[in-house]
Interface confidence: low
């Protein structure tokens, strides 16, 4: 699908063109780019009105559209992987031609956060409504489309072309037709301003080929910031009409001579320019000599002028242009200062947030506050940061040091703590004995008991578990002599295994291990090897495991 230029609006130092055609955002940008422009910016309410005007022009010429809502790409995009920033007017989007984050925005609805794919913005037009100030086109964010799949309901796009300056449209003093050809390859017979380097073709006469005269002009920069056609006097003048046709092509007054000839003149306070058509104010400010947002202020008796800058800007060396003042040089912020056009903003380092006494102050974020702690167990807030700690029987783990991992006391550096069987539990351990042995009152040693061929002696009673003093962590796994269904041993969710002292006589019998709270009870046989897998909560090794693992505080441990 191609794209047709249907409409053009030139104002200030920019031209906007509107095109119809179902293109992806990249194809639309490429189309604008080929002619030296970009997808249009909408950086202010005024610019939104210019864009709306060119769209209205396009829609007036377009065969009536049957869609009530229509979308047109503009140059606002967010790259893949860049996330939404709700604090900014552009929400983390940026203009394709570059430039600052601008204060104006007109979002259609609340944006959903998604960093996965590239997102592009289109103007959403309600074609059923007149163009009212309250109905400036809304910004709609969505997928950027692709060739052959341009995006849902995209009708076209708007380009913007920027120029050094503009010429006034040529004025005709008699019948004729002007055709302007712009540097961005648009032809038009009616432009309110004609961009620098445009060509004008003037065909005089009422259409009879014999009478037609042609003139060709180029919009040139005559002097710094002064643009004109280099023509003198009204074009296509005819004694038949004199001043009666289009005021003789004169900007202000037209004076007729008796022979049908005429001259252009100006009202008091104005002077006739070199083109002998246009009038300019004698007021030196009327030529808008000040640039970059500077205001022209007349001197005494209206003879000279000075330029004045808005707050946050200062005059440059030319004394005509305003440049941004870098307020950050005065260190107005407690931590970070970001210079912006006409101002600045204070930001806080990671671990701090705006607040506290004074402008631009930052205060510590209490990461350990209720409901926001990133730690699995203990959390200590520090200035600008925090650190996590673990209860007895656990050590810090995880890439970010926020998780707590069970210490496997059964494979501790001092060797086994139990004389015979050692059962590691979440945050603790306890000892057991082989058949024919019973656990001594110290909970560690085994003493010879009555001869039995049953399973190993189970866990001690509640009151004589070998738990470490002061441990408040509930035991996550216990050993039990009971067999599984049909006597079949099953896998267990815990990665810690009961260990056997290597010199003890072994009688194999399955033990029921209860999974951590919230997980199904599953089965595993005791092992004669010391545990080699990391103990504590761990993801199942893969596959379709039905075992759920969970931290003891129920958090996912993400900081």
């Amino acid at each position: 699908t191609g794209a047709d230029t249907e409409a053009v609006v030139c104002v200030g130092t920019a031209c906007y063109t509107a095109h119809s055609g179902k293109l992806s955002a990249a194809e639309a940008q490429n189309h604008c780019n080929q002619n030296g422009g970009n997808l249009a910016t909408v950086k202010s309410k005024e610019e939104a009105q210019h864009v709306q005007r060119v769209l209205a022009q396009l829609l007036r010429r377009e065969a009536a559209l049957t869609a009530r809502m229509s979308k047109f790409w503009i140059g606002l995009q967010r790259e893949k992987g860049k996330c939404l920033d709700p604090s900014l007017p552009l929400k983390g989007f940026s203009w394709v031609g570059g430039g600052e984050d601008t204060p104006y925005s007109n979002w259609h609805k609340e944006l959903r956060n998604s960093c996965i794919s590239k997102r592009c913005v289109s103007l959403l037009l309600d074609l059923s409504q007149p163009l009212l100030p309250s109905r400036l086109p809304k910004w709609s964010e969505g997928p950027c489309g692709s060739p052959g799949s341009p995006g849902s309901n995209i009708e076209g796009f708007v380009c913007k072309f920027s120029f050094k300056g503009m010429c006034r449209p040529l004025a005709l003093g008699g019948p004729g037709q002007v055709t302007y050809t712009t540097p961005f390859q648009t032809t038009s017979s009616s432009l309110e301003a004609v961009p620098f380097a445009s060509a004008a073709n003037v065909a005089c006469g009422e259409g009879d080929k014999d009478e037609t005269q042609s003139h060709y002009f180029l919009c040139k920069e005559k002097a710094p910031d002064v643009f004109d056609w280099g023509s003198s006097g009204p074009l296509c003048v005819s004694p038949k009409y004199g001043c009666n046709f289009n005021n003789g092509g004169c900007h202000q007054d037209c004076f007729e001579g008796g022979d049908g000839s005429f001259l252009c003149g100006c009202r008091p306070g104005f002077r006739l320019l070199d083109d002998l058509v246009t009038c300019a104010s004698r007021n030196p400010c009327s030529s808008s000599p000040c640039r970059g947002g500077a205001t022209c202020v007349l001197g005494p008796h209206g003879k000279n002028y000075t330029c004045r800058c808005p707050q946050g800007y200062q005059l440059d060396s030319s004394q005509l242009d305003c440049v941004d003042v870098d307020e950050c040089q005065d260190s107005p912020c407690a931590q970070e200062c970001v210079n912006t056009p006409g101002g600045f903003r204070c930001e806080c380092w990671v671990g701090y947030e705006p607040g506290g006494p004074g402008e631009g102050a930052c205060q510590d974020v209490d990461e350990c506050a209720l409901g926001r702690s990133p730690c699995a167990q203990g959390c200590t807030n520090t200035d600008g940061s925090f650190h996590c700690s673990c209860e007895e029987g656990y050590v810090l783990a995880g890439e970010d040091g926020t998780q707590c991992q069970d210490v496997d006391e059964c494979v501790g550096p001092g060797g086994p703590l139990c004389d015979s069987l050692c059962f590691n539990t979440q945050g603790s351990f306890h000892c057991g004995c082989l058949p024919g042995w019973v656990l001594a009152p110290n909970g560690v040693s085994c003493t010879m008991g009555p001869v039995s061929l049953g399973p190993p002696s189970g866990p001690p009673d509640e009151e004589d578990k070998g738990e470490k003093e002061g441990s408040t962590v509930p035991r996550a796994a216990t050993a039990s002599p009971t067999r599984g269904p049909e006597g079949t041993p099953k896998a267990t969710p815990t990665t810690s295994r009961p260990s056997l002292s290597s010199d003890a006589p072994i009688t194999s019998a399955p033990l029921k291990m209860l999974a951590p709270s919230g997980s199904p009870g599953v089965w595993r046989e005791p092992s004669i090897h010391h545990a080699t897998a990391a103990s504590g909560p761990q993801e199942p090794a893969g596959g379709d495991s039905s075992v759920a693992t969970q931290n003891n505080d129920g958090t996912d441990g993400q900081k």
Epitope: Q49, R60, A64, R68, S128, P130, P133
Partner: antibody
Framework: QVQLQQPGAELVKPGASVKLSCKAS????????MHWVKQRPGQGLEWIGE????????YYNQKFKGKATLTVDKSSSTAYMQLSSLTSEDSAVYYC?????????????WGAGTTVTVSS | DIVLTQSPASLAVSLGQRATISCKAS??????????MNWYQQKPGQPPKLLIY???NLESGIPARFSGSGSGTDFTLNIHPVEEEDAATYYC?????????FGGGTKLEIK
């Protein structure tokens, strides 16, 4: 050529309802909005409301909400306006008129009008 | 609602002369460079006919002796030179805001 055809007259009793029709021809019916305008004898023009034939969206002048109901039949390219609970105040000529779909919605084609007389 | 006041209510103009009809809006009907003001002509027993749209654009098929001008709140319809067939009532209409409203009309007689 582009035409909007309306029946010449309707005579109705007070309290009754009437459904006026406006048949479009010579253009794509769903590409233009259809408006209805009231003109009392010797008086000016009053806009009643508009309907988008493609999706049946309607916008009404608050003054006529509850009095007029606009509908369309796309298959016959006909727009309708039902007037309910008629009184002598509703005696008028009712015009249908089309407008472009976007921007300045001036009425470029008008029907000849239907004269509604409310009388017992 | 935007109220449109037309003046004069009626006028009589000699054949070949200029007829000027004014329409004042209670608030601006301009937006982004366009004026949402339209002019219609209505003859007895006939529907209104579009003459001028967007303040100054001549509808196709309308003679060039009809012209419109103005912006904001003040608009004018000019007919020059007036012809016999121009005897009618002329209405201005704004389409900038709902409800669309019409002026009270100006009756033009040819002397």
């Amino acid at each position: 050529q582009v035409q909007l055809q309306q029946p010449g007259a309707e005579l109705v009793k007070p309290g009754a309802s009437v459904k006026l029709s406006c048949k479009a021809s010579g253009y794509t019916f769903t590409s233009y909005w259809m408006h209805w305008v009231k003109q009392r004898p010797g008086q000016g023009l009053e806009w009643i409301g508009e309907i988008d034939p493609s999706a049946s969206y309607t916008y009404y002048n608050q003054k006529f909400k509850g009095k007029a109901t606009l509908t369309v039949d796309k298959s016959s390219s006909t727009a309708y306006m039902q007037l309910s609970s008629l009184t002598s105040e509703d005696s008028a000529v009712y015009y249908c008129a089309r407008s472009v779909y976007y921007g300045n919605k001036y009425f470029d084609v008008w029907g000849a009008g239907t004269t509604v007389t409310v009388s017992s | 609602d935007i109220v449109l006041t037309q003046s004069p209510a009626s006028l009589a103009v000699s054949l070949g002369q200029r007829a000027t009809i004014s329409c004042k809006a209670s608030q601006s009907v301009d937006y982004a460079g366009d004026s949402y003001m339209n002019w219609y002509q209505q003859k007895p027993g006939q529907p209104p006919k579009l003459l001028i749209y967007a303040a100054s654009n001549l509808e196709s098929g309308i003679p060039a002796r009809f012209s419109g001008s103005g912006s904001g709140t003040d608009f004018t319809l000019n007919i020059h030179p007036v012809e016999e067939e121009d005897a009618a009532t002329y209405y201005c209409q704004q389409t900038n805001e709902d409800p669309r409203t019409f002026g009270g009309g100006t009756k033009l007689e040819i002397k």
